[in-house]
Interface confidence: medium
């Protein structure tokens, strides 16, 4: 039975040209991170893996840091990079979680970060 | 535990194009745990990777193959195929599907030899 | 692109022996994304070890992997007849390649 919940940053605003964190947090289960994969809607950003340590698509290795923790630095943002973001959570013995970030991306300077949620 | 089996015809006309498929059993294509790639080994050589596909379609290819290189996903028949467009007889070697953890490559198919001839 | 040259190319030895297999990176490599493969004639190649010394599931203890960097080893402690194959290592940079691969053969 899968008693963890993934919690994120939630709803979150950065500026164009800057960079943001994209972090969740698995709790409430004592069921070992084998792996975290952080996606963007159709694309591999990034692998954490507990064992080999990170690896970075090809495709945002210029723009993609590791870290800190299990999240992940996406630098030099662009409007294009406004959209849905996961972390997947493999663990064992439970399963797969999956936690769910929105990131707005701003041509202004005003970037305000959502309040945290949960997803179960 | 993973079974990977490649299909396609075993010979090919100069400039045309290779085409295979891999179907994947005991596990789903769409397992956010691998990457699904295509080696090839030329006969008597070494392994040369020709490119992976996540299962959400994101592709990476070989740079050297990459202008003649396709790889797609079908998650509804757990399958992923190849295509190599304007092949010579430098093309000609076994073709394996194998899956990947990103770091290396765990399970393999048996092979498909393709011949690159007129 | 990260090249590796493995050696010896052939190596001889009888059932019983110990085998020292190299493998030379042209520039320095993370121990997580160094892999060896053992090939026979006829088969796919077979995962036996991962991140430079890490044994794949079901692979025997005497098969072991050591190094960093530009310099990484695979030892078989005590050759077996079954062991009698071609060897691969393989990094993972920005793109997968493997070594020309060294062919080990019964004396």
């Known amino acids: 039975m899968m008693t963890g919940t993934i919690e994120t940053t939630g709803n979150i605003s950065a500026e164009k040209g800057g960079s943001i964190i994209l972090q969740c947090h698995l709790s409430s289960t004592t069921a070992q991170v084998t792996q975290v994969n952080w996606e963007q809607q159709d694309q591999l950003l990034a692998i954490c893996n507990a064992d080999l340590g990170w690896h970075i698509s090809p495709s945002f290795k210029d723009r993609v840091a590791p870290g800190p923790g299990l999240g992940l630095t996406l630098q030099s943002l662009t409007v294009n990079d406004t959209g849905e973001y996961f972390c997947i959570y493999h663990t064992y013995p439970d399963g797969t979680y999956t936690g769910r970030i929105f990131l707005e991306v701003l041509e202004s300077s005003v970037a305000e970060h959502g309040a945290r949620f949960q997803i179960p | 535990q993973l079974q990977l089996q490649e299909s396609g015809p075993g010979l090919v006309k100069p400039s045309e194009t290779l085409s295979l498929t891999c179907t994947v059993s005991?596990?789903?294509?769409?397992?956010?745990?691998?990457?699904w790639g295509w080696i090839r080994q030329p006969p008597g050589k070494g392994l040369e990777w020709i490119g992976y596909i996540y299962y959400r379609g994101s592709t990476y290819y070989n740079p050297s193959l990459k202008s003649r290189v396709t790889i797609s996903v079908d998650t509804s028949k757990n399958q992923f195929s190849l295509k190599l467009s304007s092949v010579t007889a430098a093309d000609t070697a076994v073709y394996y599907c194998?899956?990947?953890?990103?770091?290396?490559?765990?399970?393999w198919g048996q092979g498909n030899l393709v011949t690159v001839s007129s | 692109e990260i090249v590796l040259t493995q050696s010896p190319g052939t190596l001889s030895l009888s059932p019983g022996e110990r085998a020292t297999l190299s493998c030379r990176a042209s520039?320095?490599?993370?121990?997580?994304?160094l892999a060896w493969y053992q090939q026979k004639p006829g088969q796919a190649p077979r995962l036996l070890i991962y991140g430079a010394s890490s044994r794949a599931t079901g692979i025997p203890d005497r098969f072991s992997g050591s190094g960093s960097g530009t310099d990484f080893t695979l030892t078989i402690s005590r050759l077996e007849p079954e062991d009698f194959a071609v060897y691969y290592c393989?990094?993972?940079?920005?793109?997968?390649?493997f070594g020309q691969g060294t062919k080990l053969e019964i004396k």
């Open positions: 393989q990094q993972y940079g920005s793109l997968y390649t």
């Open positions: 520039q320095s490599v993370s121990s997580s994304y």
């Open positions: 005991g596990g789903s294509i769409s397992s956010s745990r691998y990457f």
């Open positions: 194998a899956s990947s953890s990103a770091w290396y490559f765990d399970y």
